[in-house]
């Protein structure tokens, strides 16, 4: 019988050089062999390119579109194929439904004295259009104690944040992640970075915990 | 190494049919759309058209009656075809590859002047 | 068809000087716009595509800007192999270029 489509596709870009269409079949498909999804630009004369899908579930499938650099223009049209048959037309402007890369290189630095210091990469290079408008989450918790989960809102532009080694507890391990948004093109959140786990040995100068002690 | 280069007469007669071969390496036809582009002595660029990679073509309005492209991906070839030369059309021809999604030319031929006279 | 016009048409400078050409188009064509560098004899190479986005393996002295009718090449310190000429190009079908700007040296 004729195959149907479930749930439209949905995608979401980069805003770099890919695209990724997640959407589902109507019944199992093994989407790399039967469908292909075609896309052009708009308005320029250019290529028709073909993404072969991959499964992404027993009824899922997802592509991921090449692109170059994204523009705020940019339209493009989607066709859904199974063989000769079309199951589904439509487009995609990737400016106006953005993911960001998620930030990478998260590293913490334990050896400033009273501070511990996350840095980590922003995940554009600088002519991108997102590079100077990505702001970012940090959140830290911890697998020694499970009541301590923070979410750090990072609203400055500098990939870093500074957290008084005082605030966490000594002698326990922390991790840390990092994701991206960018406001001004009304994104969704990145993915989490890979998670990073540091040993907090910070311990209060003995002054201070003899004044807690007695206090 | 991307390379491209345009190989074919360098001398035409007015109403005569100009054929000009694009040879490729580096890169696969099925992968890449292929541009011809000319320039006249002194003057500026001018795109002709276009084949694509799945081998559909886009043609420049001002030539579309008299211009063909085609492909054979086996031999690595582009070929343009050119009918009715005109002293007008004395002109180094360039083929240039499509870059990604986007019609400009990330890699050119170095070009073959053709010039077109009785 | 959308006309391509770039300005000046020649410009005399000296190595190490800031240069800014300028190409504006008869009709919005967003950020759909490339520059190349011809040399006498040679084939264009693309210096910038999107307006702005810097091709794979150019100097980063070379920049692009604007969008819509207005776009500029800006050569931020002038080196003896950037003379030459520069054509800009759109590409809202069918694709066009300018009629191009000499960079000679002063």
């Known amino acids: 019988g004729s195959m149907k489509v479930l749930q439209e596709p949905a995608c979401v870009s980069d805003y770099m050089s890919i695209s990724t269409c997640e959407w589902k079949m109507g019944g199992p498909t093994n989407c790399s062999a039967e469908l292909r999804l075609l896309y052009q630009l708009v308005f320029q004369s250019s290529e028709t390119h073909t993404c072969v899908p991959e499964n992404n579930g027993g009824v899922g499938c997802v592509c991921h579109l090449l692109m170059d650099d994204v523009v705020s223009m940019d339209n493009y049209t989607l066709d859904l194929w199974a063989g000769q048959q079309l199951l589904w037309k439509g487009s995609f402007k990737p400016s106006e439904h953005v993911k960001p890369r998620a930030p990478g290189n998260l590293t913490v630095h334990t050896n400033v004295s009273d501070t511990v210091l996350l840095t980590w990469s922003n995940p554009y290079p600088p002519d991108n259009y997102l590079y100077n408008d990505l702001t970012y989450a940090v959140n830290i918790w911890s697998e020694n104690d499970p009541a301590y989960s923070r979410i750090h809102n990072v609203t400055y532009l500098k990939p870093t944040l500074r957290i008084p080694a005082s605030t966490l507890k000594s002698g326990i391990s922390y991790r840390a992640r990092v994701r991206a948004w960018a406001q001004h093109y009304n994104t969704t959140w990145s993915e989490w970075s890979p998670s990073t786990k540091w040993y907090n040995s910070y311990r209060e100068p003995f002054e201070q915990r003899h004044h807690h002690h007695h206090h | 190494e991307v390379t491209l280069k345009e190989s074919g007469p360098v001398l035409v007669k007015p109403t005569e049919t100009l054929t000009l071969t694009c040879t490729v390496s580096?890169?696969?036809?099925?992968?890449?759309?292929v541009h011809w582009i000319r320039q006249p002595p002194g003057k500026a660029l001018e795109w002709l058209g276009v084949?694509?990679?799945?081998?559909?073509?886009d043609y420049n309005a001002a030539f579309k009656s008299r211009l063909t492209i085609s492909k054979d991906n086996s031999k690595s070839q582009v070929v343009l075809t050119m009918t009715n030369m005109d002293p007008v059309d004395t002109a180094t021809y360039y083929c240039?590859?499509?870059?990604?999604?986007?019609?400009?030319?990330?890699?050119w031929g170095q070009g073959t002047t053709v010039t077109v006279s009785s | 068809d959308i006309q391509m016009t770039q300005s000046p048409s020649s410009l005399s400078a000296s190595v190490g000087d800031r240069v800014t050409i300028t190409c504006r188009a008869s009709?919005?064509?967003?950020?759909?716009l490339a520059w190349y560098q011809q040399k006498p004899g040679k084939a264009p190479k693309l210096l910038i595509y999107?307006?702005?986005t810097l091709a794979e393996g150019v100097p980063s002295r070379f920049s692009g800007s604007g969008s819509g009718t207005d776009f500029t090449l800006t050569i931020s310190s002038l080196q003896p192999e950037d003379f030459a000429t520069y054509y800009c190009q759109h590409y809202v079908s069918p694709l066009t270029f300018g009629q191009g700007t000499k960079l000679e040296i002063k």
């Open positions: 009709e919005n064509i967003y950020s759909y």
């Open positions: 999107n307006a702005k």
């Open positions: 084949i694509w990679s799945g081998g559909s073509t």
């Open positions: 580096g890169f696969s036809l099925t992968n890449y759309g």
């Open positions: 240039a590859r499509n870059k990604g999604t986007r019609p400009v030319f990330d890699y």
